[in-house]
C-alpha cells in the first residue's frame, strides 16, 4: 500500500502552500525506502537516495516555479511514481447569507471570502436552536445537525424545507480543500430573514366617469403558501408619467382606489409586500403597471335600490380646501389633495 495519504482531490496531486516548506511523497514505494527525485522532463537530480529523507522530497519555501510534475525512482531505477505539486492556500471562512420568501422554507447562499487556488467543496448543515421555557433565556441543546441540501449543478445555495417560523437556526457552511477546512456559523431566525416575493398580477384600471381615479389590484405572490397562516400587508406607490416623486399608501386589502390621480396622464403603479406583523422586510417592488384615468363622466342612469350613487368628479380649484391623502411621501402642492368635491354617497 502507498505510504502517501491521498488528500481530497484528483489522484496523483499533492498540495502545498506558497512560502512554506512542502513535502512530496513517492507513492509507489514502501515507507522509508530511499528514492531519487527528478522534475518531469529534466535530467537534473533534485534529491538523491542518500538524503536521509527516504521516500519524501522536501522543498523549502515553495513558490510557483516549484509547481509541476515530479518523478521518483527507486535504487534500481524503477519508477516509484509521478506526483504533481499544486500550490494554494488553506480555506478561509466563507461568507454566508440566508433569505426566506415564505414562512416555511429558507435558503442560504455562500461565497468564498478568499480564493484558495485549490479544489474546493462545501459542507452545509443546520441545527435548530430551541428555548427552554417562556421565561428562560437559556437554550437547550440544539437539535440536529441535519444536512442543508445543496442545489444541483454546483450553485452555491442550500435550502431548508419545513422550517419553523418561531425557531432559531444555526447554519454551518464549511469550506474544505486539501489543506484544511474552515467553518462559518450563522444564526438565523425566519422572522428576521423573511422577505416575500413581490405581489403578482398587478393591474391598473380607470374608473369610468371618474377622471381622477384609478383602481389597482394584485394577488399574493405564488411563492406564499396557499393556505396562509400568516397574511401579507401591502404598500402601493404611484406617480404620474414624468413625475419624479412617488406617493405611497398602505392598502387594506388586495386593491386600492387612487382618488388623486392627475386627469389625462398615464400613471405608474407598483406594489410591495411584507408579513402583516412586520416580520422581516418589505419585498422588492413589483414590475410597474400603467393606467390612465378615464376622461368621460359617469352615465346618468337611475341606480337600482340600495346602490350607492356618487356625484361625478370635477377638477378642483387650485385654492380649494384639500385634506391630504395619507402618504409616506406626499406630492408637491399640485398633486397633494383629494378631489375637492367629495363624492357624497347617498341611498337612491
Amino acid at each position: 500500500s502507498s505510504p502517501c495519504p491521498q488528500a481530497w482531490g484528483p489522484p496523483g496531486v499533492q498540495y502545498g502552500q506558497p512560502g512554506r516548506s512542502v513535502k512530496l511523497c513517492c507513492p509507489g514505494v514502501t515507507a522509508g525506502d530511499p528514492v531519487s527525485w527528478f522534475r518531469d522532463g529534466e535530467p537534473k537530480l533534485l534529491q538523491g537516495p542518500d538524503s536521509g529523507l527516504g521516500h519524501e522530497l522536501v522543498l523549502a519555501q515553495a513558490d510557483s516555479t516549484d509547481e509541476g510534475t515530479y518523478i521518483c525512482q527507486t535504487l534500481d531505477g524503477a519508477l516509484g511514481g509521478t506526483v504533481t505539486l499544486q500550490l494554494g492556500y488553506p480555506p478561509a471562512r466563507p461568507v454566508v447569507s440566508c433569505q426566506a420568501a415564505d414562512y416555511e422554507n429558507f435558503s442560504c447562499t455562500w461565497s468564498p471570502s478568499q480564493i484558495s487556488g485549490l479544489p474546493t467543496r462545501y459542507l452545509t448543515s443546520y441545527r435548530k436552536k430551541t428555548v427552554l421555557g417562556a421565561d428562560s433565556q437559556r437554550r437547550s441543546p440544539s437539535t440536529g445537525p441535519w444536512p442543508c441540501p445543496q442545489d444541483p449543478l454546483g450553485a452555491a445555495r442550500c435550502v431548508v424545507h419545513g422550517a419553523e417560523f418561531w425557531s432559531q437556526y444555526r447554519i454551518n457552511v464549511t469550506e474544505v480543500n486539501p489543506l484544511g477546512a474552515s467553518t462559518r456559523l450563522l444564526d438565523v431566525s425566519l422572522q428576521s430573514i423573511l422577505r416575500p416575493d413581490p405581489p403578482q398580477g398587478l393591474r391598473v384600471e380607470s374608473v369610468p366617469g371618474y377622471p381622477r381615479r384609478l383602481r389597482a389590484s394584485w394577488t399574493y405572490p405564488a411563492s406564499w403558501p396557499c393556505q396562509p397562516h400568516f397574511l401579507l400587508k401591502f404598500r402601493l406607490q404611484y406617480r404620474p408619467a414624468q413625475h419624479p416623486a412617488w406617493s405611497t399608501v398602505e392598502p387594506a386589502g388586495l386593491e386600492e382606489v387612487i382618488t388623486d390621480a392627475v386627469a389625462g396622464l398615464p400613471h405608474a403603479v407598483r406594489v410591495s409586500a411584507r408579513d402583516f406583523l412586520d416580520a422581516g422586510t418589505w419585498s422588492t417592488w413589483s414590475p410597474e403597471a400603467w393606467g390612465t384615468p378615464s376622461t368621460g363622466t359617469i352615465p346618468k342612469e337611475i341606480p337600482a335600490w340600495g346602490q350607492l350613487h356618487t356625484q361625478p368628479e370635477v377638477e378642483p380649484q387650485v385654492d380649494s380646501p384639500a385634506p391630504p391623502r395619507p402618504s409616506l411621501q406626499p406630492h408637491p402642492r399640485l398633486l397633494d389633495h383629494r378631489d375637492s368635491v367629495e363624492q357624497v354617497a347617498v341611498l337612491a
Partner: antibody, heavy 118, light 107 residues
Framework: EVQLLESGGGLVQPGGSLRLSCAAS????????MTWVRQAPGKGLEWVSS????????QYADSVKGRFTISRDNSKNTLYLQMNSLRAEDTAVYYC???????????WGRGTLVTVSS | DIQMTQSPSSLSASVGDRVTITCQAS??????LNWYQQKPGKAPKLLIY???NLQTGVPSRFSGSGSGTDFTFTISSLQPEDIATYYC?????????FGPGTKVDIK
C-alpha cells in the same frame, strides 16, 4: 510592491455623491475580499463595507446601508465605493483594506479624505 | 452588532515599561480578535491576529492573549517608536467592529 492606493475624495455638499476608487497592485486582487474602513477626524476606526472576490456578496455597516454601494472590477484590480445622499457625519478619511478571512486587515491604503459640508 | 470596549482610553508610560491594554467583546467572539497600531496621519498596521499570533515582521515585544470575550494586548518593553493609538477589532461575524482605541505616549 504590494500596495493599495485610494482616490476620489474631496469636498461635497450634504445630499451629494462621490465615488471612491482603490487601485491594488502586487498581489492577486481577484483572490481576496476587499473592504472600506473610515475614520472621522480625531475619532476611531469604523468598518464601512466589504465585498467577496466574485462580487457576489456584499456587507454594509448600518450607518451607510442604502446609501453606499461597494463594487469591484477584477480586470482593473480596482475597488469602488459609490457614496450617495452624503451627510456631515460621513466626513472621514476612507481607507481601502485587504482582509484575510473577511476581517483580518493585513494591508491598508494611505486613505482619502471625504469632507461633507455646505 | 458586537460592541468592543477598550481600557484604558489613554496611558503614559516610561521607556522600558510593560504596557497592558484590555479589550472586551459584548459576546463570545472565539479568538477572532486582532490588534492594530496607528500612528498620527498614518494608516493602521496589523500587529496581532487571532488573539495571539504575531503578524510577520512585527517585533516580538508585542503580544496578545485571551479568548471568548476578554483579551489582552501587551508591549513587554515600551520603545519611543511605540507612541501610537492601539485598536482591537473583532471579526467573528460578517460586520467587523473596532474598539474605541487606547492612546499610548511616553512619560
Amino acid at each position: 510592491e504590494v500596495q493599495l492606493l485610494e482616490s476620489g475624495g474631496g469636498l461635497v455638499q450634504p445630499g451629494g455623491s462621490l465615488r471612491l476608487s482603490c487601485a491594488a497592485s502586487g498581489f492577486t486582487f481577484s483572490w481576496y475580499s476587499m473592504t472600506w474602513v473610515r475614520q472621522a477626524p480625531g475619532k476611531g476606526l469604523e468598518w464601512v463595507s466589504s465585498i467577496v472576490p466574485s462580487g457576489g456578496h456584499t456587507q454594509y455597516a448600518d450607518s451607510v446601508k442604502g446609501r453606499f454601494t461597494i463594487s469591484r472590477d477584477n480586470s482593473k484590480n480596482t475597488l469602488y465605493l459609490q457614496m450617495n445622499s452624503l451627510r456631515a457625519e460621513d466626513t472621514a478619511v476612507y481607507y481601502c483594506a485587504k482582509p484575510l478571512d473577511w476581517g483580518r486587515f493585513d494591508l491598508w491604503g494611505r486613505g482619502t479624505l471625504v469632507t461633507v459640508s455646505s | 452588532d458586537i460592541q468592543m470596549t477598550q481600557s484604558p482610553s489613554s496611558l503614559s508610560a516610561s521607556v522600558g515599561d510593560r504596557v497592558t491594554i484590555t479589550c472586551q467583546a459584548s459576546q463570545d467572539i472565539n479568538n477572532y480578535l486582532n490588534w492594530y497600531q496607528q500612528k498620527p496621519g498614518k494608516a493602521p498596521k496589523l500587529l496581532i491576529y487571532d488573539a495571539s499570533n504575531l503578524q510577520t515582521g512585527v517585533p516580538s515585544r508585542f503580544s496578545g492573549s485571551g479568548s471568548g470575550t476578554d483579551f489582552t494586548f501587551t508591549i513587554s518593553s515600551l520603545q519611543p517608536e511605540d507612541i501610537a493609538t492601539y485598536y482591537c477589532q473583532q471579526y467573528d461575524n460578517l460586520s467587523p467592529t473596532f474598539g474605541p482605541g487606547t492612546k499610548v505616549d511616553i512619560k
